[in-house]
């Protein structure tokens, strides 16, 4: 009886098991009982990343500089191009189809996790004893100045946006 299922890396056509084309190659013609599957290498800027019976290769992804993209890894006949973002930007999706500027942490907030090529900045509110007075994508919350260690006293309390103001101790006359 003709086969109803085929081995791995084969496909069933016309009651016959034919070899799939290897990654990096596309199908030109199905096998017969006299000749094997005919496959051809993908062209320049094309790829196929699996054993396949595709008649067309896929185009490599284009890393559009107008969208802030650059090539992280050049594609081959078996792999797609991997795009990443230019310095100071991160991908807006898993497939990195566009980029966005890293979000700065506003005053009162500090950087908990720096942005990467794939993730945005993670900010957190400065807790008591810490402040941030700048809008920055890399500055953490800074601890208030310790007036005591400088033999000074607090003249103005700190907030999450401002440091304490130290001053000299009043002398008893």
């Amino acid at each position: 009886e003709p086969p109803t299922a085929c081995r791995e890396k084969q496909y069933l056509i016309n009651s016959q098991c034919c070899s799939l084309c290897q990654p990096g190659q596309k199908l030109v013609s199905d096998c017969t009982e006299f000749t094997e599957t005919e496959c051809l290498p993908c062209g320049e800027s094309e790829f196929l990343d699996t054993w396949n019976r595709e008649t067309h290769c896929h185009q490599h992804k284009y890393c559009d500089p107008n969208l802030g993209l650059r090539v992280q890894q050049k594609g081959t006949s078996e792999t797609d191009t991997i795009c990443t973002c230019k310095e100071g930007q991160h991908c807006t999706s898993k497939d990195c189809e566009a980029c966005a500027q890293h979000t700065p942490c506003i005053p009162g907030f500090g950087v908990m996790e720096m942005a990467t090529e794939t993730t945005d900045t993670v900010c957190h509110p400065c807790p008591v004893g810490f402040f941030s007075n700048v809008s920055s994508a890399f500055e953490k919350c800074h601890p208030w100045t310790s007036c005591e260690t400088k033999d000074l006293v607090v003249q103005q309390a700190g907030t999450n946006k401002t440091d304490v103001v130290c001053g000299p101790q009043d002398r008893l006359r």
Epitope: N14, T32, E33, F34, T35, E36, E38
Partner: antibody, heavy 117, light 107 residues
Framework: EVQLLESGGGLVQPGGSLRLSCAAS????????MSWVRQAPGKGLEWVSG????????YYADSVKGRFTISRDNSKNTLYLQMNSLRAEDTAVYYC??????????WGQGTLVTVSS | DIQMTQSPSSLSASVGDRVTITCRAS??????LNWYQQKPGKAPKLLIY???SLQSGVPSRFSGSGSGTDFTLTISSLQPEDFATYYC?????????FGQGTKLEIK
């Protein structure tokens, strides 16, 4: 024991016709692809035509396309080659062969076709 | 059609010799190549299939190698019964095609 026995060869004039037969025995004929291969006197081998198993497709060398027709009768365990519009360059020993995994593992003894006026 | 070119066309050797016959395809055929032996007045016999697999019943002194466009048939130690004509045959593209043959003669 696998056996393939060709018949039907002979002398024919250019433009004439001939039908070759190949009687198969010793195996399940319908389960195998079959082919015809020829060899001109003192020359090499030339694949002529093939027919798939289970009533599969038919395939021809460009040199015989449109003139030769391969067929099979699974009930009679017989392979045929109908040859029309014969030319002097078709003169050869014609072998039938059984196919398995893209190779011809059993061959007949051949039958001589001579095209001459 | 794919052209198959064998070399040499003829070869003289002695019993016990190691012999290599080459076959070149006009384009890549992966490992889709068979080797046949033919003795005068007889039908061809399949020796090697898929470039390097030995057909059942064929002595182990026969071996095949190669892929892409260049292939070789090697007989490690010639026996008297090995003097014959050898053909390569590709099955990577329709139609299947044979090399022109290599005639192996006794020196």
């Amino acid at each position: 024991e696998v056996q393939l026995l060709e018949s039907g060869g002979g002398l024919v004039q250019p433009g004439g016709s001939l039908r070759l037969s190949c009687a198969a025995s010793g195996f399940t004929f319908s389960s195998y692809a079959m082919s015809w291969v020829r060899q001109a006197p003192g020359k090499g081998l030339e694949w002529v035509s093939g027919i798939g198993s289970y009533g599969g497709g038919t395939y021809y060398a460009d040199s015989v396309k449109g003139r030769f027709t391969i067929s099979r009768d699974n009930s009679k365990n017989t392979l045929y080659l109908q040859m029309n519009s014969l030319r002097a360059e078709d003169t050869a020993v014609y072998y039938c062969a059984r196919y398995v995994n893209f190779g011809m593992d059993y061959w007949g003894q051949g039958t001589l076709v001579t095209v001459s006026s | 059609d794919i052209q198959m070119t064998q070399s040499p066309s003829s070869l003289s050797a002695s019993v016990g010799d190691r012999v290599t016959i080459t076959c070149r395809a006009s384009q890549s055929i992966s490992s889709y190549l068979n080797w046949y032996q033919q003795k005068p007045g007889k039908a061809p016999k399949l020796l090697i299939y898929a470039a390097s697999s030995l057909q059942s019943g064929v002595p182990s002194r026969f071996s095949g190698s190669g892929s892409g466009t260049d292939f070789t048939l090697t007989i490690s130690s010639l026996q008297p019964e090995d003097f014959a004509t050898y053909y390569c045959q590709q099955y990577g593209r329709n139609p299947p095609t044979f090399g022109q043959g290599t005639k192996l003669e006794i020196k």
